[in-house]
């Protein structure tokens, strides 16, 4: 499956929506700063096949989408903005979805990526707890931000890569 | 290849103006803040300011507060850091270097060559 | 501003040697703590960082370690090329700030 121009559009314009999104001074949150501990072995092509690859970036987008659609998240972030995000991530859930399909069966997928998908649920999960642990304050959630805009970006890079291996 | 690399040394009398660059190269951009580090002649390591590229937010040591001026050009991939009115005291070599930002990474891990600012009468 | 002070200023030391090298923050830092080398007339290069973690390229005889206000750095078998001036940053707050400097010298 070629990943179509539009998905990687699409990617760099919630990139760009991400930015738009802060609200503090990002000086002020030094001090919060945290290792995720981003599954970067999850997404390296060069060890992963295409299809594992295409289902990390789903479970990844699948799971930015619930962060960011939670009450907390509402309180924290300009509505306009955020309805924005959450339209370029559902059009990118819909051509992963697209992709995953045509690349192998739903049921081999499943199986297959299964370590995968684990482990960038693992990775959200430490997001979440760590925003609980901060009382989701306004610095904790900028420093979300940052390691979203990261991990966006990782993967963006790697769907360039992906494309020009077709 | 991440590089940062850093206008030539300058030779200035005191009262005037300067502007010194660091542009970026190798990675992206807006993804890292720049930092500005002065070193005295035979002294050790002063930070002086830091510039978040993507906004041009910056933030300052109080002792350079009002002293020096940082910004950026994030169409060139460029931090600069200017004097308006030059003082002997400020004779240093100038680096800057890059930071995460909010990111869990490591702090200043590419640095420039240093710019060395010469002022005197 | 949160100072940091380095101790000692100066050491002599030969091939083969342990060094340590300590860093103390005026107040908690809790891990927020980085390591440079600097060599005369040369930018200076990150060791560690976030207290303990290596920088990707650093030879593993550098270690750092310590929390809260105390750090330390240690050169577990003292290298030729090593002979140089070290230097502690605080990266919990701005204005970052740096210790004053460490110079190891050939015994």
């Known amino acids: 499956c070629d990943l179509p121009q539009t998905h990687s559009l699409g990617n760099r314009r919630a990139l760009i929506l991400l930015a738009q999104m802060g609200r503090i001074s990002h000086f002020s949150c030094l001090k919060d700063r945290y290792d995720f501990g981003f599954p970067q072995e999850v997404f390296d092509g060069n060890q992963f096949q295409k299809a594992q690859a295409i289902s990390a970036f789903h479970e990844m987008i699948q799971q930015t989408f619930n962060l960011f659609s939670t009450k907390d998240s509402s309180a924290a972030w300009d509505e306009t903005l955020l309805d924005k995000f959450y339209i370029e991530l559902f059009q990118q859930l819909n051509d992963l979805e697209a992709c995953v399909t045509q690349e192998v069966g739903v049921e081999e997928i499943a199986l297959m990526n299964e370590d995968s998908i684990l482990a960038v649920r693992k990775y959200f999960q430490r997001i979440t707890l760590y925003l609980m642990g901060k009382k989701y304050s306004p610095c904790a959630w900028e420093v979300v931000r940052a390691e979203i805009m990261r991990s966006f970006s990782f993967s963006t890079n790697l769907q360039k890569g992906l494309r020009r291996k077709d | 290849e991440v590089q940062l690399v850093q206008s030539g040394a300058e030779v200035k009398k005191p009262g005037e103006s300067l502007k010194i660059s660091c542009k970026g190269s190798?990675?992206?951009?807006?993804?890292?803040?720049i930092g500005w580090v002065r070193q005295m002649p035979g002294k050790g390591l002063e930070w002086m300011g830091i510039?978040?590229?993507?906004?041009?937010?910056?933030a300052y040591s109080p002792s350079f507060q009002g002293q020096v001026t940082i910004s950026a050009d994030k169409s060139i991939s460029t931090a600069y850091l200017q004097w308006s009115s030059l003082k002997a005291s400020d004779t240093a070599m100038y680096y800057c270097?890059?930071?995460?930002?909010?990111?869990?990474?490591?702090?200043?891990?590419?640095w420039g060559q240093g710019t060395l600012v010469t002022v005197s009468s | 501003d949160i100072q940091m002070t380095q101790s000692p200023s100066s050491l002599s030391a030969s091939v083969g040697d342990r060094v340590t090298i300590t860093c103390r923050a005026s107040?908690?830092?809790?891990?927020?703590l980085n390591w440079y080398q600097q060599k005369p007339g040369k930018a200076p290069k990150l060791l560690i960082y976030a207290a303990s973690s290596l920088q990707s390229g650093v030879p593993s005889r550098f270690s750092g370690s310590g929390s809260g206000t105390d750090f330390t750095l240690t050169i577990s078998s003292l290298q030729p090329e090593d002979f140089a001036t070290y230097y502690c940053q605080q990266a919990i707050d701005l204005p970052f700030t740096f210790g004053q400097g460490t110079k190891v010298e050939i015994k």
């Open positions: 107040q908690s830092i809790n891990r927020f």
């Open positions: 190798g990675y992206s951009f807006t993804s890292y803040w």
């Open positions: 270097a890059r930071h995460p930002g909010l990111n869990w990474a490591p702090d200043f891990d590419y």
């Open positions: 510039i978040d590229p993507s906004d041009s937010d910056t």
